[in-house]
Structure formats: structure tokens, C-alpha cells
């Protein structure tokens, strides 16, 4: 079959890292400078990536792969292949249009990233709290009061009705 | 022959967003780049980025990241060029044109649409 | 990012006259990667030279390329009317590509 394609299409030759030149007679023309091909039978390579600002290098393109980039610190990558890089936040707290803003009573962040998500309610699995929730940690739920020793007692705050994703401001 | 045609004339408010499209004649539209390049009026050219048909693979100049998103569909060769939270400064004419890196040029380019941004 | 200089923006010749513009980069371009567009008022930009020295097809013979690192230039050895126009280099040394600001041959 690969000697079939090579008949029909010359350009089935090229190796990645090279690109099929229609300008010289479909000749496999090595990638220019900055540039890649990941696949053989290109007809064109690609500019490579480049991690400025925000991004930094995480592997060098070569003429057969593209750069990698991921975030300096203080930043973490979103989107494929690290499309974006959003500030990190303190445990505790989450990132809203106005900066990180730490999370409301009833929710918890114990990640750098990410939104303040409600804190377990013990109750709804017929548990206690056995260790209060906190800003950067979800309760810890322990035995059902049926099982507590007499004259102990625990209470479990309601979790606050807030949407997924929206951020108090 | 090898032709690109671009859409016509826009004339939008500031903040809005704006899709411009160049569809693709007389070529196999995945082998070659489709640049997008911008000229203020009696100005020079500055080059927006491309994309690749073939991998759907794009590339901002820095100066255009966030500003420009390209995309293409490969069923009609038509390549888009969306300008987002447009301002004053966004009013130009903006071409497409055909590219392939290895040599580096732009071989043919469209008419040009002319983007107005003013209230 | 490779900035490119046409230091001339306007240049006045007459019918007949040789004619020399020049582009400068702020640092070295292969030549390989080196070009040159011709747009006429109201057009759009037409690849006229690449890799410094390739006429683009339908350039007459009069227009000539030269150059390396990071001086190059546009020659046309005898100028005619339908040479008004604005001239622009570019540039490939990974992105972005970049342009000259043009330099407009008027015809006096």
C-alpha cells in the first residue's frame, strides 16, 4: 500500500520534519528555521509556538514537533495544550473577574485553581461533622449522632444554595 | 485560476465582534496557510497570524492574540477571521492570503473587506 | 520580533530613471525569506520579488533584487509609468512575519 501511495502522491514520501515543495517539483524541502512538521507528506510546515510572557518553555520545538509551553509560577495552565495560564489563588479562596476572593462561609477551596465548592452536608448520609469545615478544608463527617456517646452533640451547617462557577463578589 | 474572495464591507459598533470570510478557488485549499495581514488606512501591512487547513493548527502574531480568532471550514475552503471587542483602532481593511511556510511569501490574496468601527 | 526599516517613504523618478529602494532589518534575514510586494492605490498587495531575487511571474526584466543580512533593496534599471506605486519588504524568521512600512515611487 506504501509503495501504491508513493506512486500516486510523491509527496507520500516527505518525513516529518520536512515539507513537499511544489515550487521544486514536489521535492521533500527541509522545514525552515522556527518551523515544524509532525507528519510526513506536508505540503507546508508550521511556525512554531512560542512561550512569551505568562507562558515558558517547557520543551523546545524541533523540526518535527512543536514547542511546549506551561505557566511561570504563580500561574497554572487551562485549555489544550496549555492554551491559557490563570493566576493562582491561596487555599481558600477562588478566582473572580475582580482577583482571588476567599471563598463565602458553607465553601471550601483546598486547591490553588479552581472554584469554592459547598462543604459536605454530614446529615444527608445520616453522619455528624466531626470536624468543622474551613475556608481551605471540607468537614470531616464522623459516626451518626445515633452512634455518639450520650451528651455529645453536632451540628451541621447548611450548605449554601450557590450555582457551580459563579463567584461571590 | 486560484482566486480568494473575500466577504464585503462591514460597518459595526465599538464592542461588538465582526466575522470576516474568504473562500478559496482554483487550489487544494489544506495545502497552503491562509494568512490574514491588516492595513489602517495609509498605513502599511501587519501581519494578524494564519491557519492551517490541513491540521487546523493557528497562529497569532502576539500583537493580535485575543483579538482575532481564525477558523476554517474545510467542506466550502472558506477560511473566518472573528475580531472581537472592537474599538476604533480595529477599522482597517483586512486581507486574506495564501501562504505556505517554506517559502516564506504570500502568493495571492484576496480583495480585501473594509471594517468600519464607529458609533 | 525582526523589525523592518524602508527609510524612504516617498521616492520621485522620472520616465527612464533607474530607480534603487532599500530595506533593512533589524537583524539578519535569510535571504531565502526575503520578499517583496508591489500595491498599487485601492489594490491589494501582489508578491513581486521572493527570496530577494525571484521576479514573481509577470514582473518585467527591468525590476531586480539583491541583497543579504540585513540590507536589502529593490532596483528597476528604467522606470515606467506603471511602476507608481508603493513597494513593500517582508520578511519569515518565525513569527511573526513582518513588513517594511513601504516605500511609494511616484512618477514625475
Known amino acids: 500500500f506504501e509503495r501504491t501511495r508513493s506512486l500516486q502522491d510523491p509527496c507520500s514520501n516527505c518525513p516529518a520534519g520536512t515539507f513537499c515543495d511544489n515550487n521544486r517539483n514536489q521535492i521533500c524541502s527541509p522545514c525552515p528555521p522556527n518551523s515544524f512538521s509532525s507528519a510526513g507528506g506536508q505540503r507546508t510546515c508550521d511556525i512554531c509556538r512560542q512561550c512569551k510572557g505568562v507562558f515558558r518553555t517547557r520543551k523546545e520545538c524541533s523540526s518535527t514537533s512543536n514547542a511546549e509551553c506551561d505557566c511561570t509560577p504563580g500561574f497554572h495552565c487551562l485549555g489544550a495544550g496549555c492554551s491559557m495560564c490563570e493566576q493562582d489563588c491561596k487555599q481558600g479562596q477562588e478566582l473572580t473577574k475582580k482577583g482571588c476572593k476567599d471563598c463565602c462561609f458553607g465553601t471550601f477551596n483546598d486547591q490553588k485553581r479552581g472554584i469554592c465548592r459547598p462543604w459536605t452536608n454530614c446529615s444527608l448520609d445520616g453522619k455528624s461533622v466531626l470536624v468543622n469545615g474551613t475556608k481551605e478544608r471540607d468537614v470531616v463527617c464522623g459516626p451518626s449522632p445515633a452512634d455518639l456517646s450520650p451528651g455529645a452533640s453536632s451540628v451541621t451547617p447548611p450548605a449554601p444554595a450557590r450555582e457551580p462557577g459563579h463567584s461571590p463578589q | 485560476q486560484v482566486q480568494l474572495q473575500q466577504s464585503g464591507a462591514e460597518l459595526v459598533r465599538p464592542g461588538a465582534s465582526v466575522k470576516i470570510s474568504c473562500k478559496a478557488f482554483?487550489?487544494?485549499?489544506?495545502?497552503?496557510?491562509i494568512n490574514w495581514v491588516k492595513q489602517r488606512p495609509g498605513q502599511g501591512l501587519d501581519w494578524i497570524g494564519y491557519?492551517?487547513?490541513?491540521?487546523?493548527?493557528?497562529i497569532y502574531n502576539q500583537k493580535f492574540e485575543g483579538k482575532a480568532t481564525l477558523t476554517v471550514d474545510k467542506s466550502s475552503s472558506t477560511a473566518y477571521m472573528e475580531l472581537s471587542r472592537l474599538t476604533s483602532d480595529d477599522s482597517a481593511v483586512y486581507f486574506c492570503?495564501?501562504?505556505?511556510?517554506?517559502?516564506?511569501?504570500?502568493?495571492?490574496w484576496g480583495q480585501g473587506t473594509t471594517l468600519t468601527v464607529s458609533s | 520580533d525582526i523589525v523592518m526599516t524602508q527609510s524612504t517613504a516617498i521616492m520621485s523618478a522620472s520616465l527612464g530613471e533607474k530607480v534603487t529602494m532599500t530595506c533593512r532589518a533589524s537583524?539578519?534575514?535569510?535571504?531565502?525569506?526575503l520578499h517583496w510586494y508591489q500595491q498599487k492605490s485601492g489594490a491589494s498587495p501582489k508578491i513581486w520579488i521572493s527570496?530577494?531575487?525571484n521576479l514573481a511571474s509577470g514582473v518585467p526584466v527591468r525590476f531586480s533584487g539583491s541583497g543579504s543580512g540585513t540590507s536589502y533593496s529593490l532596483t528597476i534599471s528604467s522606470v515606467e509609468a506603471e511602476d507608481a506605486a508603493t513597494y513593500y519588504c517582508?520578511?519569515?524568521?518565525?513569527?511573526?512575519?513582518?513588513f517594511g512600512g513601504g516605500t511609494k515611487l511616484e512618477i514625475k
Open positions: 527570496s530577494t531575487s
Open positions: 491557519i492551517n487547513p490541513y491540521n487546523d493548527y493557528s
Open positions: 517582508q520578511q519569515y524568521s518565525g513569527n511573526p512575519y513582518t
Open positions: 537583524s539578519s534575514v535569510t535571504s531565502s525569506y
Open positions: 482554483g487550489f487544494t485549499f489544506t495545502h497552503h496557510h
Open positions: 492570503a495564501r501562504g505556505g511556510l517554506g517559502r516564506g511569501y504570500f502568493d495571492y
